[in-house]
Interface confidence: medium
């Protein structure tokens, strides 16, 4: 019968000839009366056999990631008779892995959106690297993820690549972050190879800012000849939020005279001061009103940011008109 052990050849061997093992018949008494032959894909080009001893050699550098096993056939012939000593047999040469491939992130570019002020632990995105080395061969393809850039706002779970928030972020201070993740094979041990990827994390707006008046005091004038409904001027608040979170409504907080009103221009987000009833210079030549501004949409959970609406004082001077 045939005698052999399992055949392994390390990939990427630089030697011109690397001994893999020996194929022999148990009928071979070592007197060189048998001839061994190798057949199949790779026979003669990648692998050769010593016809007398049955020793098998690899004569080419191999790449496991290109081909991880070779199935060959062996024959043994009695030189004197030309007959097969053993039935032809199939055997396998496995290419054993070395750590020659760095981890690669295949789904780049990564981009994620997460609401500002999200609590610690909020999941942002999962990044995954692939390593072409053999996952069953030691730690060559066992990866560990780490954060190269992004502290203290983000963290990455070492074994899963899940990125989480580790510190609250305010979009109004910074609206996007570049996080750099490294994947290292050999679970970080010496000889490890690594790959990196960048993740663009954008913060979406939440309504965490109330509108605030640009000026604490406004002055407007109104002619005593102005009809009711006249727009006498505008006031404006600013809101650091964006979109519908910055939409606001103006209103009168205080006007003992009940002479003025404020309407909101939702296009420009300005407050328009309107004359509600006619004024008379001889009766009163200036007025003071207090206006307030609030956001249009405030979810219940964000009301804590909107206590005490911003107010402004508007001093309105009446202009005299010569009366006939």
């Amino acid at each position: 019968g045939w005698v052999w052990n399992q055949f392994f050849v390390p990939e990427e061997m630089n030697t011109t000839s690397h001994h893999i093992g020996q194929l022999r018949s148990d009928l071979d008494n070592g007197n060189n009366s048998f001839q061994y032959k190798l057949l199949g894909a790779g026979a003669g080009s990648t692998f050769i056999i010593d016809e007398r001893t049955g020793d098998i050699y690899a004569i080419q550098k191999l790449d496991r990631e290109e081909r991880s096993l070779y199935i060959l056939r062996a024959q043994v012939i009695d030189i004197a008779t030309g007959r097969a000593v053993e039935p032809e047999s199939e055997f396998v040469i496995k290419v054993s892995d070395i750590n020659d491939n760095e981890p690669k992130f295949l789904d780049e570019p990564y981009e994620a959106i997460v609401p500002e002020m999200s609590p610690e632990g909020t999941l942002v995105i999962q990044v995954t690297a692939s390593d072409a080395d053999d996952p069953s061969s030691g730690n060559n393809a066992r990866l560990l993820y780490s954060l190269l850039q992004g502290q203290p706002y983000f963290s990455v779970e070492p074994t899963t690549g899940v990125i989480r928030i580790s510190s609250k972020m305010d979009r109004e201070l910074q609206d996007e972050y570049w996080v750099i993740i490294q994947a290292k094979d050999m679970i970080g041990q010496p000889g490890a190879l690594s790959g990196t990827t960048s993740v663009l994390i954008k913060l979406s707006d939440v309504n965490d800012n109330k509108p605030i008046f640009k000026e604490s005091l406004y002055r407007l004038t109104v002619s005593e000849s102005a009809p009711t409904g006249t727009s006498i001027g505008t006031i404006m608040a600013y809101d650091n939020d964006i979109g519908e979170n910055a939409e606001m409504d103006y209103s009168i907080e205080e006007d003992d005279s009940q002479t003025f009103d404020i309407i909101t221009n939702h296009e420009t987000q300005e407050g328009i001061v309107i004359l509600k009833k006619k004024v008379d210079f001889e009766h009163q030549n200036h007025y003071g009103i207090r206006a307030k501004v609030k956001n249009h949409h405030v979810p219940e959970q964000l009301m804590k940011y909107h206590t005490e609406a911003s107010t402004t004082f508007i001093k309105i001077q009446v202009e005299d008109v010569d009366e006939p």
């Epitope: 000026e215 604490s216 005091l217 406004y218 002055r219 004038t221 003992d256 030549n285 200036h286 003071g288 004082f313 001093k315 001077q317 202009e319 005299d320």
Partner: antibody
């Protein structure tokens, strides 16, 4: 004649208090909004506070809000500025000034009173 | 807050010469809401011009104001000895702020 005369200035330690007065004469005091404006030594003018003709509205510069209080007594034609928690940077000549009826610029000023805050 | 910047800081001129003082605002000021004041040493400020170009009561016509938007000018056509003083611009359209002053001194 038409005039404003300030009084009540002096030297005070940081954290201390002073009350300035401004006596008006020669015009209808109760018809005018009144202001305090200050001038630090060798510096420019800085508006401090305003009070409406009837005392109904008051407003303050950010630098003094919460520490200074403007008030008036129309029956005595007098404007006041109560200054608490004084700071070294409050050292200045304090002027009272009248706002015009048709606008909000100052058409009449007093000669000023010097407030020195020093330890 | 509207910031007013006056230039030059000091103007050295002789009596009889023309003085041109500039006041620039950090944002547009309605011309109705700009005033100029004169302050002589040891005295209170005195209103010269309001509404950018209207002379206050009792102010000689050698003083004139002009400008709009963010650039305003006070002109003294022929300097008299009593005109050597510090001049301040003030906006009163949105709260009250003053420029840092221009000193007109005798050359």
């Amino acid at each position: 004649q038409v005039q404003l005369v300030e009084s009540g200035g002096g030297v005070v330690q940081p954290g201390g208090s002073l009350r300035l007065s401004c006596a008006a004469s020669g015009f209808s005091f109760s018809s005018y909004d009144m202001d305090w404006v200050r001038q630090a030594p060798g510096k420019g003018l800085e508006w401090v506070a305003v009070i409406w003709y009837d005392g109904s509205n008051k407003y303050y510069a950010d630098s003094v809000r919460g520490r200074f209080t403007i008030s008036r007594d129309n029956s005595k034609n007098t404007l006041f500025l109560q200054m608490n928690s004084l700071r070294v940077e409050d050292t200045a000549v304090y002027y009272c000034a009248r706002e015009t009826g048709e606008g909000w610029y100052f058409d009449l000023w007093g000669r000023g009173t010097l407030v020195t805050v020093s330890s | 807050e509207i910031v007013l910047t006056q230039s030059p800081g000091t103007l050295s001129l002789s009596p009889g010469e023309r003085a041109t003082l500039s006041c620039r605002a950090s944002q547009s000021v309605s011309s109705s809401y700009l005033a100029w004041y004169q302050q002589r040493p040891g005295q209170a400020p005195r209103l010269l011009i309001y509404g950018a170009s209207s002379r206050a009561t009792g102010i000689p016509d050698r003083f004139s104001g002009s400008g709009s938007g963010t650039d305003f000018t006070l002109t003294i056509s022929s300097l008299e000895p009593e005109d050597f003083a510090v001049y301040y611009c003030q906006q009163y359209g949105s709260s009250w702020t003053f420029g840092q002053g221009t000193k007109v001194e005798i050359k």
